[in-house]
């Protein structure tokens, strides 16, 4: 008998899922972009913002070509599930206040969502080490004032605009190895 | 279409060693992790060891460790397992599998018998 | 004992609507790892069904669908039809293992 039959192509290949996590990092760049724009013209902020609960950004972009697939993509993921709960926390905590925002926080949330599946998708297919996740972070505390809150804002914005960015150019140099 | 062609099973007794392949067309087969995956006889599906897509990274099931051995040539397409010291309990269908795994072959009988 | 934990059997009529449940743990369904859906018809190797909890692999009717909630997923089967009766598998990854984990596997059968 003749070889077993084929499998249609049914998913996507690694690299074309590169590609697309590419775009919706490029996407989720513009919408943080975006989304900072309007909070620094709703709630003007002057100097930098820190909070002690962000990830410090994983490197400078001059330091990505020495950098091996795993390391990215793990450093990434945990990185942006970081993102994910306090962009989570400050819609909580900050509901009335950052209404004006609102839609767009929500469509942030849900964007970095599925960029997060994509990622771990990616590293499956790839068959990457997905190391045990963190365990659980004690949860943020609220606010001390609603100015409190908005310099938050202003502080996980501004690291997930870098940490995007990062992103962004990690993924394009790691598309070239792959 | 995708094909993963496994091939190397048969009879072999307990103690002994066997050479699984597994020969891969149809996709970019560099671009993939690979995974063994078996199945005993009227039983569940157990994976076994997966081998990521350059081979730099190689895992295994607790209950094959230091014993069976995953490697891959990407300039042959083709995924290996080498199985020593082989035991009654490996008995099992083994399949190749690529990425989550999205594709699997046909799959390869192992009989560990005296 | 498997680490997802399937119902060993379910059972419907052509036409009906099916549910197959699979539980995990905090270390791998939820711990934002996808759960995937394998379909394994009579004597032949496992198809991917479900992917990333509820995307549908090109070619696979969309009487299929998944869903993910907390430390569970679940496969739907809607309009059952005979050739449905296979045994379905959810798998998930679990980072300890560095590799998937399968359910023990559910028996469908149409009555």
């Known amino acids: 008998p003749g070889p077993p039959p084929g499998s249609p192509r049914a998913s996507p290949d690694p690299r074309a899922e590169l590609d697309s996590t590419v775009l919706l990092t490029r996407s989720l760049l513009e919408d943080t972009r975006q989304l900072t724009i309007q909070l620094k013209d709703k709630f003007p902020a002057d100097g930098d913002h820190n909070l002690d609960s962000l990830p410090t950004l994983a490197m400078s972009a001059g330091a990505l070509g020495a950098l091996q697939l795993p390391s990215v993509l793990t450093r990434l993921r945990a990185d942006l599930l970081s993102y994910l709960r306090h962009v989570q926390w400050l819609r909580r905590a900050m509901g009335s206040s950052l209404k004006t925002l609102e839609p767009e926080l929500g469509t942030l949330q849900t964007r970095l969502d599925r960029l997060l599946r994509r990622l771990q998708l990616l590293m499956s297919r790839l068959a990457l080490p997905q190391l045990p996740p963190d365990p659980p972070a004690p949860p943020l505390a609220p606010p001390s004032s609603t100015w409190g809150g908005i310099r938050a804002a202003h502080a996980i914005l501004g690291g997930l605009h870098l940490t995007l960015d990062w992103a962004v150019r990690g993924l394009l140099l790691l598309k070239t190895r792959l | 279409e995708v094909q993963l062609l496994e091939s190397g099973g048969g009879l072999v007794q307990p103690g002994g060693s066997l050479r699984l392949s597994c020969a891969a067309s149809?996709?970019?087969?560099?671009?993939?992790?690979m995974h063994w995956v078996r199945q005993a006889p009227g039983k569940g599906l157990e994976w076994v060891a997966v081998i990521s897509y350059d081979g730099s990274y190689k895992y295994y099931a607790d209950s094959v460790k230091g014993r069976f051995t995953i490697s891959r040539d990407n300039s042959k397409n083709t995924l290996y397992l080498q199985m020593n010291s082989l035991r009654a309990e490996d008995t099992a269908v083994y399949y190749c599998?690529?990425?989550?795994?999205?594709?699997w072959g046909q799959g390869t009988l192992v009989t560990v018998s005296s | 004992q498997s680490v997802l934990t399937q119902p060993p059997s379910a059972s419907g009529t052509p036409g009906q609507r099916v549910t197959i449940s699979c539980s995990g743990s905090s270390s791998n369904i939820g711990s934002y790892y996808d759960v995937h859906w394998y379909q394994q018809l009579p004597g032949t190797a496992p198809k991917l069904l479900i992917y990333s909890n509820e995307e549908r692999p090109s070619g696979v009717p969309d009487r299929f669908s998944g869903s993910k909630s907390g430390t569970s997923a679940s496969l739907a089967i809607s309009g059952l039809r005979s050739e449905d009766e296979a045994d379905y598998y959810c798998a998930a990854w679990d980072p300890s293992l560095y590799g998937p984990v399968f359910g023990g596997g559910t028996k469908l059968t149409v009555l």
């Open positions: 599998a690529a990425g989550v795994p999205d594709y």
């Open positions: 149809g996709f970019t087969f560099s671009s993939y992790g």
